[in-house]
Amino acid sequence: EPHSLRYNLTVLSWDGSVQSGFLTEVHLDGQPFLRCDRQKCRAKPQGQWAEDVLGNKTWDRETRDLTGNGKDLRMTLAHIKDQKEGLHSLQEIRVCEIHEDNSTRSSQHFYYDGELFLSQNLETKEWTMPQSSRAQTLAMNVRNFLKEDAMKTKTHYHAMHADCLQELRRYLKSGVVLRRTVPPMVNVTRSEASEGNITVTCRASGFYPWNITLSWRQDGVSLSHDTQQWGDVLPDGNGTYQTWVATRICQGEEQRFTCYMEHSGNHSTHPVPSGKVLVLQSHWQ
């Protein structure tokens, strides 16, 4: 897994008029890290984890950068010609990565009303766009504006690759992010489903990194995919992740089913609580 920094900026227009506020979200290694969501941007770390990475300093630098980026994106939205009545959004997603072999990747993507219309590889400066005529029109529009306005938006659009990587390296220096492993808490619950059946759910939370195996087994054998339901692996707001898997089983057969969990080379099995007990919590060994 490479280390990554991802900026997600969104600006809005209403009836052709660009709104003053903007939303910026920054993800570090896939985790919510910083956020600006006010008219006046103030970079806010997302949880203790982000504060630990940033250290005991003010976030003036982040606030300044994110505010500047937001202003530039608002200018870009103002130059999109075909804005119709109602609410419209322009979104810019910028990602940079540092891989284990120290190679780097950087890219930038533009979305209008949630639809991708322009991408750039920030290393090769190569632009790509979808085939649809709407996307092509929007892409030409934005690219022309970026060329015309190159001086004003120079910092934003030309130093992005270097800036993003520089910031990522700075955050990684904190040591908090570096390849830590946090084991999950596993929690098995049961609920009545229908006559003679129960639904058993296995939840894993508070783990890092995000790669995890979670599945139900009957007598030690994995159930097929189509007999299980999986939740997405999602950030839980604490710099860690959570997910779940559920299946339906016959009442009275609970003891034959176990939730199997594997994470960062460690593994454990968790039984279904029997009878009236609703929750069984256990840390794996």
């Epitope: 009957q218 007598d219 030690g220 054998v221 159930l223 097929s224 057969e253 003891q255 034959r256 199997y260």
Partner: antibody
């Protein structure tokens, strides 16, 4: 006493079909997952197919996928293996085996086996 | 797919001797490992399940250990009826792969 008795083996030409049966007794068949395992003459054991209780989960070895079909009839306490497009390399003794309750995917009882010979 | 290897492929031992057979998985299989004994012309019998649990009715001279990728079957004092072929089998994946077997014969 737990008993598994296979039948249906025999000599068949390449490309031909056979249906193996496994009759179970001495236990509540419907509450156990079952398997077919084979052993070529003078060779080791090779798992072929798995079927869970209520037939909700079925797995096949890559070597037989698309050619063999496992099924069960809980009322008749029987396990079946329909073998189509048979090849020379399918020649083996075929065992049916029960999965142990609350084990680790353990085959706790096996039948005596039935020999399938694929040859022209 | 998970590959299972066993060593040695065969061994000669005397009655009363301690015998150790090892089984290695190409990737971690947790404790999802079973050991079987098969005598010529007979069906296999399970000895050990879940890497180290002794199957009911199996003599206590048989024991299993290991987790992850490396596993061991030990016969503390070989008896005449123990001369057979021993197979390990993984059940972590849905391939239920058997090892190639270890033949134990009389020295």
């Amino acid at each position: 006493e737990v008993q598994l008795v296979e039948s249906g083996g025999g000599l068949v030409q390449p490309g031909g079909s056979l249906r193996l049966s496994c009759a179970a007794s001495g236990f509540t068949f419907s509450t156990y997952s079952m398997n077919w395992v084979r052993q070529a003459p003078g060779k080791g054991l090779e798992w072929v197919s798995y079927i869970s209780t209520r037939s909700s989960t079925i797995y096949y070895a890559d070597s037989v996928k698309g050619r063999f079909t496992i099924s069960r009839d809980d009322a008749r306490k029987s396990l079946y293996l329909q073998m189509n497009s048979l090849r020379d390399e399918d020649t083996a003794v075929y065992y049916c085996a029960r999965v142990m309750v609350r084990g680790s995917g353990t085959f706790d009882y096996w039948g005596q086996g039935t020999l399938v010979t694929v040859s022209s | 797919d998970i590959q299972m290897t066993q060593s040695p492929s065969s061994l000669s031992a005397s009655v009363g001797e301690r015998v150790t057979i090892t089984c290695r998985a190409s990737q971690s299989i947790s404790y999802y490992l079973n050991w079987y004994q098969q005598k010529p012309g007979k069906d296999p019998k399970v000895l050990i399940f879940a890497a180290s649990s002794l199957q009911s009715g199996v003599p206590s001279r048989f024991s299993g250990s290991g987790s992850g990728t490396d596993f061991t079957l030990t016969i503390s004092s070989l008896q005449p009826e123990d001369f057979a072929t021993y197979y390990c089998q993984e059940s972590h994946s849905i391939r239920f792969t058997f090892g190639p077997g270890t033949k134990v014969d009389i020295k």
